[in-house]
């Protein structure tokens, strides 16, 4: 409550998160031209990536291009790479959408399809849709513990969202457990009216807002966080404007003294923790 006589000060905050959960992933792979279903277990180290600032990331889906090495190969067929003769390719050309440097040759990709040859990590990553349903659809059952320390230096007051004696086996609930700092990912999405399984396919950005409205006067002391959630990415984004949230990373290895890599296009949810509020004191 805004008391006119109070001196207000904005919150200074630090955040630390811990994600927990295990996912069973059923991946379809092609081995010697035969499709196989591979079961694997993903733990925290497999699906989280270190992020800067007050954010954490959870992988929910992925596409793999295995056994890439640096050599010459035909581009993946697209409108920009298909060609009918060498004239449709240009030596040294680097298209922003391309994965390599053109050699100037138009070569057979497959059957009667011809594409421009490139010097790149080959084979070139295919242009394909993210798997449906998401491979880590079960990530909605993962939980995140949010540790939030706050400070009002002008009022010489420090506190945190986790107080001694808190039941650490709790799960946040808007009405039944509003002070619990452990959040089930699926519940966060339910709160914003979004379907976790839908967002998990292409990825997205979710805001976790922590609002501190602190009255630091001795007789009316109140300083507890209020949690709310907000979808931050544009869910109406047109396909051509890259909906969702994804990035690529590679795992490098050597095979017969040749450097190779597995390229992984990762789709997932970035959670941004937004801490704001004020502390007022007479």
């Amino acid at each position: 409550s805004d008391k006119l006589y109070q001196r207000k000060e904005p919150v200074i905050s630090s955040v630390h998160t811990k994600v927990k959960g295990i996912a069973e992933v059923k991946e379809e792979i092609v081995e010697n031209g035969v499709k196989k279903l591979v079961h694997s277990v993903f733990d925290t180290a497999d699906y989280t990536f270190p992020l800067q600032g007050n954010s954490f990331f959870v992988m929910t889906n992925f596409l793999k291009t295995e056994g890439q090495e640096q050599r010459l190969c035909p581009e993946y067929p697209t409108r920009r790479t298909l060609c009918s003769s060498d004239r449709g390719c240009k030596k040294g050309w680097m298209d922003p959408q391309s994965k390599g440097i053109q050699t100037g040759r138009c070569v057979v990709y497959e059957g009667n399809q011809k594409t421009c040859e490139v010097s790149a990590w080959c084979p070139i990553e295919a242009v394909e849709e993210a798997p449906r349903p998401a491979l880590l659809n079960s990530a909605e059952n993962f939980t995140v513990l949010i540790k939030n320390n706050i400070d009002f230096p002008g009022h010489n007051y420090t506190t945190r969202n986790i107080l001694p004696g808190l039941n650490i086996t709790c799960t946040f609930h808007k009405t039944q457990n509003p002070q619990c700092p452990i959040f089930r990912l699926g519940d966060i999405f339910r709160e914003t009216g979004d379907n976790f399984s839908d967002v998990a396919i292409q990825g997205g950005i979710m805001g976790i807002e922590i609002y501190w409205d602190c009255n630091l006067d001795r007789w009316f002391h109140h300083c507890r966080p209020k949690y709310s959630f907000r979808r931050l990415d544009d869910k109406t984004t047109n396909v051509s404007l890259y909906p969702g949230y994804n990035f690529r990373y590679a795992k490098y290895y050597k095979e017969n003294n040749v450097e190779k890599r597995t390229l992984i296009k990762v789709f997932g949810i970035r959670f941004d923790i937004l801490v704001f509020g004020t502390g007022g004191k007479f």
Epitope: R79, C83, S84, G88, W93, P96
Partner: nanobody, 129 residues
């Protein structure tokens, strides 16, 4: 979806001239590179001429110096002026459009049929000797 309608085809004597026109509708015309292709019976579709959204042009080797492509962004049309016509110019002429909204089509790609998303139904040109 972009609709393309060709007109101006017909029968002409060798050495004569014809002016084809392509009328576009349904999309922001000025964001598209426009091309003319032709296909003679039993042959592959062949590049004739193209003009990018910013006015850069390219011509097929067999029509250089005889054909001229232009564009009228106010009328959403792409005329193709064909002079000194030869019997080997006989074919169905198609108009095509390539989206340049997210970036220009490189000049060396303007002749590639794969760059073009939208195609007209074609207009017949017959050159008699």
């Amino acid at each position: 979806e972009m609709q393309l309608v060709e007109s101006g085809g017909g029968l002409v004597q060798a050495g004569g001239s014809l002016r084809l026109s392509c009328a576009a509708s349904g999309r922001t015309f000025r964001h598209y590179a426009m091309g003319w292709f032709r296909q003679a019976p039993g042959k592959e579709r062949e590049f004739v001429a193209a003009i990018s959204s910013y006015g850069s042009t390219d011509y097929g080797d067999s029509v250089k110096g005889r054909f001229t492509i232009s564009r009228d962004d106010a009328k959403n049309t792409v005329p193709l002026q064909m002079n000194s016509l030869k019997p080997e110019d006989t074919a169905v002429y198609y108009c095509a459009a390539a989206d340049e909204t997210l970036g220009a089509v490189p000049n060396f790609r303007l002749h590639e049929k794969y760059e073009y998303e939208y195609w007209g139904q074609g207009t017949q040109v017959t050159v008699s000797s």
